[in-house]
């Protein structure tokens, strides 16, 4: 049996694991001293609940949900985490000037529960 990736949130619209965007400045992120650009980042992250088998990433997540139903004070419910990422290029300050650096795991592209 494979993991069931239910995409209907049983808690109601917008309450389950989903992609969320937060606008943040370099100062907000604590990057102002080493990043030149962009001055503002649209940070995409995974936020929300993981009830039942909602967006279960794999069989492990499915098992975790079942065990959570048996002993919820010991086995936590699955967590909402990125399933994949979008790359982002930052212009960084260096000792000799600036450099372009690509970060492959900075922005969430989509989310699942694990």
């Amino acid at each position: 049996a494979r993991a069931r990736n239910g995409d209907h949130c049983p808690l109601g619209p917008g309450r389950c694991c989903r992609l969320h965007t937060v606008r943040a400045s370099l100062e907000d992120l604590g990057w102002a001293d080493w990043v030149l650009s962009p001055r503002e980042v649209q940070v995409t992250m995974c936020i929300g609940a993981c009830p039942s088998q909602f967006r279960a990433a794999n069989m492990h997540a499915q098992i975790k949900t079942s065990l959570h139903r048996l002993k919820p004070d010991t086995v936590p419910a699955p967590c909402c985490v990125p399933a994949s990422y979008n790359p982002m290029v930052l212009i960084q300050k260096t000792d000799t000037g600036v450099s372009l650096q690509t970060y492959d795991d900075l922005l969430a592209k989509d989310c699942h529960c694990i």
Epitope: R15, S52, Q53, R69, D73
Partner: antibody
Amino acid sequence: EVQLQQSGPELEKPGASVKISCKASGYSFTGYNMNWVKQSNGKSLEWIGNIDPYYGGTSYNQKFKGKATLTVDKSSSTAYMQLKSLTSEDSAVYYCARPGRYDGAWFAYWGQGTLVTVSA
Amino acid sequence: QIVLSQSPAILSASPGEKVTMTCRASSNVNYMHWYQQKPGSSPKPWIYATSNLASGVPARFSGSGSGTSYSLTISRVEAEDAATYYCQQWSDNPLTFGAGTKLELK
């Protein structure tokens, strides 16, 4: 406002079966496990088991396996518990109860209870 | 299964008195939850995750403990506190309740 409305009292003969209901309102029914708890004669509480209304998965206290069967009807936001092969030991008040959070381990909401009396 | 032993079974107190009831688990549990029940009524959530008061519970109540020993304390008992208090664990399957402590007022 979250409400759990249970069906009325039942008087059954030994050996019979009974099915009691718990109608949920004021929240998304499929998002929270529904639990059932037994209280005999004003004594302590016993957890019978629970059901995930979204997928129908169940977990039972070993003591009540074969005695209780939990089901749901998503269309009417109603949970059911059937008790079979009734004996005097099954005479009790039965509660449905819902956790405070979808991942909670304590019951924030309780039905008013259904009294089941087994008597010849 | 984890057995929860509550003591005392019956606790008699005068208004204004400080009282403590205990719940001992046969094995370590991560949290303890407490309910209040009055005759003819459903149990009410009272304290969850060891020390958090449920909605509407007066601040004179508090909970504490860890491992196998937990307690519920009322700093100054009032008449409306007369009830039976049950502890509950769900660190292991099956979920279990204690036998209850009945608080009576003198």
